[in-house]
C-alpha cells in the first residue's frame, strides 16, 4: 500500500478546479491539521 507522500510541504486544493488553482501548490498545512501528525497508515476498504 502506498501511503500519503509528505515529502512536499505544499498542497493543492482537491476541489478548487484547474482554472482556479492554476496547478499551484500552496505552501500551507493540510486542511485537517492532524493529518500532518505521525500515525498508523490507514487501511482503506479497497485494500482489504
Amino acid at each position: 500500500m502506498e501511503d500519503f507522500n509528505m515529502e512536499s510541504d505544499s498542497f493543492e486544493d482537491f476541489w478548487k478546479g484547474e482554472d482556479l488553482s492554476n496547478y499551484s501548490y500552496s505552501s500551507t498545512l493540510p486542511p485537517f491539521l492532524l493529518d500532518a501528525a505521525p500515525c498508523e497508515p490507514e487501511s482503506l476498504e479497497i485494500n482489504k
Epitope: N5, F11, E12, D13, F14, D19, S26, P31
Partner: antibody, heavy 120, light 116 residues
C-alpha cells in the same frame, strides 16, 4: 483519525428547505474547499458547489444557483448546506467532501452521507 | 450529448486486467483535462482513486494500490482507468469526473462485475 461527520436523515415536504451539517471530527478545517455532492437513487454523483471554510467564499453549480446556500461556522469546524424550494427529484444522499493533493498523491475526505427524502 | 460518457457495465474474471473508459464529448479535448476516477461501493461515499492528465501530471489517491492506474486515448478522446490483477473486492461502480466550465462534471458510471 479525521472524519467528516454529517447530520442525520431528513424527510421534507415539497416547497420546504433542508439544512445539512458537516463537522470535521478530530481535526480543524483549513483553507481548502468543502464541496457538496449529491447522489439520487441509482444515479451518478452531482456536484452542487463548494465553500472555502477560511473566507466563506462560495462557488455554486449553475443548476443550484438561487436555491442553495453554503455556510460554515469555524468555531465548531462545521459546514452547512441549505437547499430551498425542495422538489421530489431532490431526493438523494447528500455528501460533503474535502481534500488536497501533493505533487504525487491526493487525499480525499467524505462524510458518510445524509439521506434527504422529499415527499408529500 | 453528455459531457462524459461511460459504458454502463463491464464484467471480467479475477486476475484479469480491465480498462474502464470515460469518453469526453466532441469538442472537449481530453488532453486539456485532468480525469478523476472514483470507486463507489453500495452504501458508501465515492472514494478517490487517482487523477490523470499526462505521465508527468498524475496523482494517486492515498492508500490506493498501484494496480489502479490512469492513461488516456487521444484518438478516442477518452480517459482510461486500468485495473490490473482484478480482485473480487474491486466489484463496484466507477465514476470519472472533470472540472469543466467552472463546475465538476461526473460521468454516469460503470458497474464493474467480477465474475466467479
Amino acid at each position: 483519525q479525521v472524519q467528516l461527520v454529517q447530520s442525520g436523515a431528513e424527510v421534507k415536504k415539497p416547497g420546504s428547505s433542508v439544512k445539512v451539517s458537516c463537522k470535521a471530527s478530530g481535526g480543524t478545517l483549513s483553507s481548502y474547499a468543502i464541496s457538496w455532492v449529491r447522489q439520487a437513487p441509482g444515479q451518478g454523483p452531482e456536484w452542487m458547489g463548494w465553500i472555502n471554510p477560511n473566507s466563506g467564499g462560495t462557488n455554486y453549480a449553475q443548476k443550484f444557483q438561487g436555491r442553495v446556500t453554503m455556510t460554515r461556522d469555524t468555531s465548531i469546524s462545521t459546514a452547512y448546506m441549505e437547499l430551498s424550494r425542495l422538489r421530489p427529484d431532490d431526493t438523494a444522499v447528500y455528501y460533503c467532501a474535502s481534500g488536497y493533493c501533493s505533487r504525487f498523491n491526493c487525499k480525499d475526505y467524505w462524510g458518510q452521507g445524509t439521506l434527504v427524502t422529499v415527499s408529500s | 450529448q453528455a459531457v462524459l460518457t461511460q459504458p454502463s457495465s463491464l464484467s471480467a474474471s479475477p486476475g484479469a486486467s480491465v480498462s474502464l473508459t470515460c469518453t469526453l464529448r466532441s469538442g472537449i479535448n481530453v488532453g486539456a483535462y485532468r480525469i478523476y476516477w472514483y470507486q463507489q461501493k453500495p452504501g458508501s461515499p465515492p472514494q478517490f482513486l487517482l487523477r490523470y492528465k499526462s505521465d508527468s501530471d498524475k496523482q494517486q489517491g492515498s492508500g490506493v494500490p498501484s494496480r489502479f492506474s490512469g492513461s488516456r486515448d487521444a484518438s478516442a478522446n477518452a480517459g482510461i482507468l486500468l485495473i490490473s490483477g482484478l480482485r473480487s473486492e474491486d466489484e463496484a461502480d466507477y465514476y470519472c469526473a472533470i472540472w469543466h466550465s467552472s463546475a465538476w462534471v461526473f460521468g454516469g458510471g460503470t458497474q464493474l462485475t467480477v465474475l466467479g
